[in-house]
């Protein structure tokens, strides 16, 4: 069971300091951006991190949304990352959900975060280069010190 708590506005970066944004095709991508680029591209660079109370504490449960014309929420349905047009629900009556990720700091590094899927144990949000694009994907990882599954989250509130 997940119950919605408060939300915060955040900028998410990979460890190469590239900024996560949602492109015109609703794809989550990373790009080099100056602070002014980041502001100019808002709200596509501003993510709503919705925190949830978890009936089985396993880290901070979050849903990640973005509000452009409508609110879209990050999903890892079938292990594929996409933004679905939906509001994060107030309650989820299950211990797993395709929109819930566990946000945890990397041991010894409070500013570096990992996001593990609640639906797929051992699968993490990751940044991966595909041709010329840096994409946000869901990746099964058993080397947890890999920088591709680490992110920084800068609060904008």
């Amino acid at each position: 069971y997940f119950g919605k708590l408060e939300s915060k506005l955040s900028i998410i970066r990979n460890l190469n300091d590239q900024v996560l944004f949602i492109d015109q095709g609703n794809r989550p991508l990373f790009e080099d951006m100056t602070d002014s680029d980041c502001r100019d591209n808002a709200p596509r660079t501003i993510f709503i991190i919705n925190m949830y109370k978890d009936s089985q504490p396993r880290g901070m449960a979050v849903a990640i949304s973005v509000k452009c014309e409508k609110i879209s929420t990050l999903s890892c349905e079938n292990r594929i990352i996409s933004f679905k047009e939906m509001n994060p629900p107030d309650n989820i009556k299950d211990t797993k959900s395709d929109i819930i990720f566990f946000q945890r700091s990397v041991p010894g590094h409070d500013n570096k975060m990992q996001f593990e899927s609640s639906s797929y144990e051992g699968y993490f949000l990751a940044c991966e280069k595909e041709r010329d694009l840096y994409k946000l994907i869901l990746k099964k990882k058993d080397e947890l010190g890999d920088r591709s599954i680490m992110f920084t989250v800068q609060n904008e509130d």
Partner: antibody, heavy 126, light 107 residues
């Protein structure tokens, strides 16, 4: 309690291949990997590689990658490690081990080698 | 590759002694470090994971500490059954790498 039972000792000639098996008995959760580790006489533990039973993807240590093949038969819960072009320096005890997530009190994951096979002695001698 | 430098390579001690073994990683391994004990003719046995978390069933005289690149295994009061070889293992990145091992012998 998970147990790993390995095949018996082998004596091989230089240039030959050896295939060691590792059978899982007992209840094992999903989301584990098989790793292979060896210990040569008078030396320390050495990681050889791993296989993911979910998709058969492998990662090998650079020094073994041209000679080692790790496979897994999900229907029999058995992992295999084949080492080819054997030389005398490959004389060692070979271990299979499971690589699984353990979690701390905040749910943070850590992978550990928890269950180990009893070891298989491979002797390479002419 | 991440290098794990373990020291000392061997140590002689008596029952009741306090023993410390260290592992130095060539880069930050984010506490993805485990400690194993191996006795002759036996498979390694997990003692500590996540640098400082005691595996179930392991006596509390064993403890681990460290972060970043520096890690320590401490046995607070040696018992006769503790004489064995100890290894650290970094699980941060492939290839996984073990320390060279520390042989703990009776003085």
């Amino acid at each position: 309690q998970v147990q790993l039972v390995q095949s018996g000792a082998e004596v091989k000639k230089p240039g030959a291949s050896v295939k060691v098996s590792c059978k899982v008995s007992g209840e094992i959760s999903t989301g584990y990997y098989f790793h292979w580790v060896r210990r040569r006489p008078g030396k320390g533990l050495e990681w050889m590689g791993r296989i993911d039973p979910e998709d058969d993807s492998t990662k090998y240590a650079e020094r073994f990658k041209d000679r080692v093949t790790m496979t897994e038969d999900t229907s029999t819960d058995t992992a295999y490690m084949e080492l080819s072009s054997l030389r005398s320096e490959d004389t060692a005890v070979y271990y299979c081990t499971t690589w699984r997530i353990y979690r701390d009190s905040s749910g943070r994951p850590f992978y550990v080698m928890d269950a180990w096979g009893q070891g298989t002695l491979v002797t390479v001698s002419s | 590759d991440i290098q794990m430098t373990q020291s000392p390579s061997s140590v002689s001690a008596s029952v009741g002694d306090r023993v410390t073994i260290t592992c130095l990683a060539s880069e930050d391994i984010y506490t993805y470090l485990t400690w194993y004990q191996q006795k002759p003719g036996k498979a390694p046995k997990l003692l500590i994971y996540g640098a400082n978390k005691l595996q179930d069933g392991v006596p509390s005289r064993f403890s681990g500490s460290g972060s970043g690149t520096d890690y320590t295994l401490t046995i607070s009061s040696l018992q006769p059954e503790d004489f064995a070889t100890y290894y650290c293992l970094q699980g941060s990145k492939f290839p996984l790498t073990f320390g060279q091992g520390t042989k703990l012998e009776i003085k």
